[in-house]
């Protein structure tokens, strides 16, 4: 590359025959040598030319030569078939020198005035070559004043000869299991003065196979083996080649995972080169035989190193390795020709023995103990005392290995206790407290814990009671001794239950009236439902139609009797509901503060007195019969009343349960 222009001294001038513009003399010989700077040539043209014409300009002539080459021999005035006169032609030196020779012979038949010529040095455009001549540069030629330089396309580098472009074709590494490689520019002629190295490097265990494809044309020699251009193939085992000529070499099975291909070219020749398609092989793994009820994917004729297959089981079958389940299975062929994992089994899905249903049973429908795919089981609840909650109880063993209901549920059905069952089918007449018989009040709960109180069983693990009855134990739930399934207060034969937690209505304020006098006790275990232990129902929305004024409810408990002692046997009384305004008015005179009776309360009893609940009955249920469902429900909770139970003109006051259904449902669902 030039280091910046160095302008040469200008070269130009005039030449003329001796005596010009007069006639030239005989026997004259004159020689001019013109020299231009390197990279420049000389341009010459004639402004006047008048020499004796002779055959082939033998007599008088002007001869132009550049180096050893004669550019022109000129004579006459006009050109003929055999002689040339310059006319308007311009003459150029071949290099930077031009020799001009003028000669006249011994005689002229008439006078001739000779010649006048002008010359000047001009830049040679080395990049322009005559047709058929080799180009100055392999790729790009750049002319400049006094010289030129060559450059190469991307991927080539200029050889030290400053003209040839050698290919940058070393260091290519092929790692795919198959591919193609070729001489640079294939199928166009490959570059000169190049040394190319290609590497195929596959994982250990693969063997490279080389196939020469399409055409092969590498400069050769008739006697010597590939002296000019050649292709060599080297593996860790042996060398193949050199290859040249026009014949496609045979397939080469290298038995190696690494191959080096070397291609060397010299400065001459015009050949199209070569193309190789390579593939690879490896020791095949045993053909995978799908397990029963499974299939292999993908299916191939053979499986070699790095090839893999997966096993897919039919619906209702699962992948197992022994007892251990697999979500998917893929094995890969290793270099030693073995699979990296053993074949799993496709075993029929087994949902296993179904879970026991609390308060229910399960029946095998498909067959005794059959728990495999598509097997059917039927859950049912213990009749009379339990009913299945929104579920038909039919479960199928599905492909995911879970027992699944017709609604797609995987959880067990729920056996809910039947509520409101009683040996009493109707309310009795209004008369004094009666002894309860077995099964009359199976929801009745006896609460001992400092004082005697009562409650009513809800579902199979909750007790509904009055807030004031359990207020002292709200932070020590385990102190509550809860008994059920007995009529006799002091009997040793009862079902024991213990409290897990006590929930007192947030609106209840102890020692400040009895508004919101309601509480729930969560039992730490479910109780077994039977004819003597059955929950009470919560009121339906329509329940108020069975709780109008004068409708009869039943209160039960072991509270104080008319004799002033706690009852030994469970007692009950049938009492009518009292008009709310009447009840409110009854408790507005001293000693009761105004507003004692709220909208969250209902009153029951006789105006004449004598029939009432009393201390010790607190928290017990005031129940009513829903004549539509024929089930008993809790309408009230024994809360408070006159200082003297059963006093005339006073009434028992009960927490109105229907007002608390959302509160009850929220607590039960949350806990």
């Amino acid at each position: 590359t030039p280091l910046g222009p160095k302008w040469p001294e200008p070269v130009f001038g005039r030449l003329a025959s001796p005596g010009f513009p007069g006639e030239y003399a005989n026997d004259q010989e004159r020689r001019w040598t013109l020299t231009a700077p390197p990279g420049y040539r000389l341009r010459l043209y004639f402004t006047h030319f008048d020499l004796e014409l002779s055959h082939l300009c033998e007599y008088d002539f002007v001869k132009l030569s550049s180096g050893a080459k004669v550019l022109a021999t000129l004579c006459g005035q006009e050109s003929t078939d055999t002689e040339r006169a310059p006319g308007k032609d311009t003459f150029y030196s071949l290099g930077s020198s031009l020799d001009i020779t003028f000669r006249s012979d011994y005689s002229n038949e008439k006078p001739f005035t000779g010649f006048e010529a002008f010359y000047a040095a001009e830049d040679i455009d080395e990049c322009q070559v005559a047709p058929g001549e080799a180009p100055t540069c392999d790729h790009h030629c750049h002319n400049h004043l006094g010289g030129f330089y060559c450059s190469c396309r991307a991927g080539y580098v200029l050889h030290r000869n400053k003209r040839t472009c050698s290919a940058l074709c070393s260091g290519q590494v092929f790692t795919q299991r198959s591919g193609e490689l070729s001489s640079p520019e294939y199928p166009r002629p490959y570059p000169k003065l190049s040394s190319c190295t290609y590497s195929i490097s596959l994982e250990e265990g693969f063997s490279v196979i080389l196939d020469f494809v399409e055409s092969f044309d590498v400069e050769t020699h008739p006697e010597t083996l590939c002296p000019y251009d050649f292709l060599k193939i080297q593996t860790d085992r042996e060398e193949h080649g050199p290859f040249c000529g026009k014949t496609l070499p045979h397939r080469i099975e290298t038995k190696s995972n690494t191959v080096t291909i070397t291609f060397v070219t010299d400065e001459s020749g015009d050949h199209t080169g070569w193309k190789i398609h390579y593939t690879s092989t490896a020791q095949p793994c045993p053909y995978p035989m799908a397990p029963p009820n499974g299939h292999v994917s993908p299916v191939q004729a053979k499986y070699i190193l790095k090839d893999s297959f997966s096993i897919f089981c039919e619906t209702g079958y699962e992948l197992l390795q022994g007892h251990l389940p697999l979500k998917s299975f893929t094995a890969v062929c290793q270099k030693d020709g073995s699979w990296d994992r053993p074949m799993p089994a496709c075993s029929i899905v087994d949902c296993g023995p179904p879970d026991d249903l609390p308060s229910g049973r399960v029946e095998y429908i498909t067959g005794p103990g059959v728990t495999t795919y598509k097997a059917v089981i039927q859950y049912s609840c213990e009749e009379t005392f339990y009913t299945m909650k929104v579920n038909d109880g039919k479960y199928v063993c599905e492909a995911d290995g879970f027992w699944t209901s017709s609604k797609g549920e995987k959880s067990l059905p729920v056996c809910e206790p039947v509520c409101g069952l009683s040996a009493r089918t109707t309310g009795g007449q209004i008369y004094g407290g009666q002894k309860a018989k077995p099964g009359d009040f199976p929801w009745q709960v006896l609460i001992l814990g400092g004082t005697t109180a009562a409650g009513a069983l809800l579902y199979d693990n909750w007790v509904l009671t009055a807030a004031h009855a359990v207020y002292e134990q709200k932070h020590d739930a385990s102190a509550l001794d809860i008994r059920m399934g007995t009529l006799k207060r002091l009997s040793p034969h009862y079902t024991q239950a213990w409290s897990e937690a006590v929930f007192i209505h947030e609106g209840y304020t102890h020692d400040a009236g009895f508004d919101n006098d309601i509480a729930l006790i969560k039992l730490n275990n479910k109780v077994v439902i039977n004819s003597n232990i059955t929950p009470i129902c919560l009121p339906r929305k329509e329940a108020e139609s069975f709780m109008r004024t004068d409708d009869i409810g039943t209160a039960s408990g072991w509270g104080l009797t008319q004799r002033g002692f706690l009852a030994r046997n469970l007692m009950y009384v049938d009492i009518p509901i009292v008009d709310h305004q009447k009840c409110t008015a009854a408790y507005e005179k001293p000693p009761y503060p105004r507003g004692s009776v709220t909208a969250n309360m209902l009153c029951a009893g006789l105006e004449s007195g004598g029939k009432d609940s009393c201390r010790g009955d607190s928290g017990g249920a005031l129940v009513f019969l829903d004549s539509e469902t024929e089930r008993w429900f809790v309408g009230g909770i024994v809360s408070w009343g006159s200082m003297n139970c059963g006093e005339a003109g006073q009434y028992g006051v009960y927490t109105k349960v229907i007002n608390y259904i959302p509160w009850i449902e929220n607590i039960i669902s949350d806990f």
Partner: antibody, heavy 114, light 107 residues
Framework: QVQLQESGPGLVKPSETLSLTCTVS?????????WNWIRQPPGKKLEWMGY???????SYNPSLKSRITISRDTSKNQFSLKLSSVTAADTAVYYC???????WGQGTLVTVSS | EIVMTQSPATLSVSPGERATLSCKAS??????VAWYQQKPGQSPRALIY???YRYSGIPARFSGSGSGTEFTLTISSLQSEDFAVYFC?????????FGGGTKVEIK
């Protein structure tokens, strides 16, 4: 890198419930495999307790079936062991592991004592 | 349940020597057997699964063989770090069971 880590109380009273959690990192417990609980009483051999599979199905050692529950929390990539009504015989190093034991937790010693 | 019986209970071997550990199943378990190495105070380390498949990262000196009821773990040339207790484990059926272990100690 798949890692399993057991956590839970090192001391449990007799008749109470032993609760342990295995936290898995580097692999989702729903992606594949069975996820086991295995224990090793002092100086004794390993005992497989049960597994929960990628799909949430469980399999228990029949000798423990009435007392054992294995569950999982996929949002936390954890699976848990509950063993009820424990006695001194349940004192052991408890391990969680994947499938046929390619990865194990470091183990946690649980002592049953009043 | 399937009982896995390992023998010998203790094996005394010099470094560089070959160790052969045996495990017998009380009934056919196919090839559903794994081998573990356990060092004091550490959790077991998996060596072999499916009777003969070596886990990646496990040195080639460890190899497993057998099927049905008889299984072998071979350590071709014992290194100092190989002295430990080795357990076999069947996962063919519920309950999965383990052998009592073979202690490989320095002779």
């Amino acid at each position: 890198q798949v890692q399993l880590q057991e956590s839970g109380p090192g001391l449990v009273k007799p008749s109470e419930t032993l609760s342990l959690t295995c936290t898995v990192s580097g692999y989702s417990i729903t992606s594949d495999y069975a996820w086991n609980w295995i224990r090793q009483p002092p100086g004794k051999k390993l005992e497989w307790m049960g597994y929960i599979s990628y799909s949430g199905r469980t399999s228990y050692n029949p000798s423990l079936k009435s007392r054992i529950t294995i569950s999982r929390d996929t949002s936390k990539n954890q699976f848990s062991l509950k063993l009820s009504s424990v006695t001194a015989a349940d004192t052991a190093v408890y391990y969680c592991s994947r499938h046929y034991g390619d990865y194990w937790g470091q183990g946690t010693l649980v002592t049953v004592s009043s | 349940e399937i009982v896995m019986t390992q023998s010998p209970a203790t094996l005394s071997v010099s470094p560089g020597e070959r160790a052969t550990l045996s495990c017998k199943a009380s009934q056919n378990v196919g090839t559903n057997v794994a081998w573990y190495q356990q060092k004091p105070g550490q959790s077991p380390r998996a060596l072999i699964y499916s009777a003969s498949y070596r886990y990646s990262g496990i040195p080639a000196r460890f190899s497993g063989s057998g099927s049905g009821t008889e299984f072998t773990l071979t350590i071709s040339s014992l290194q100092s770090e190989d002295f430990a207790v080795y357990f076999c484990h069947q996962y063919n059926e519920n309950p999965l069971t383990f052998g009592g272990g073979t202690k490989v100690e320095i002779k």
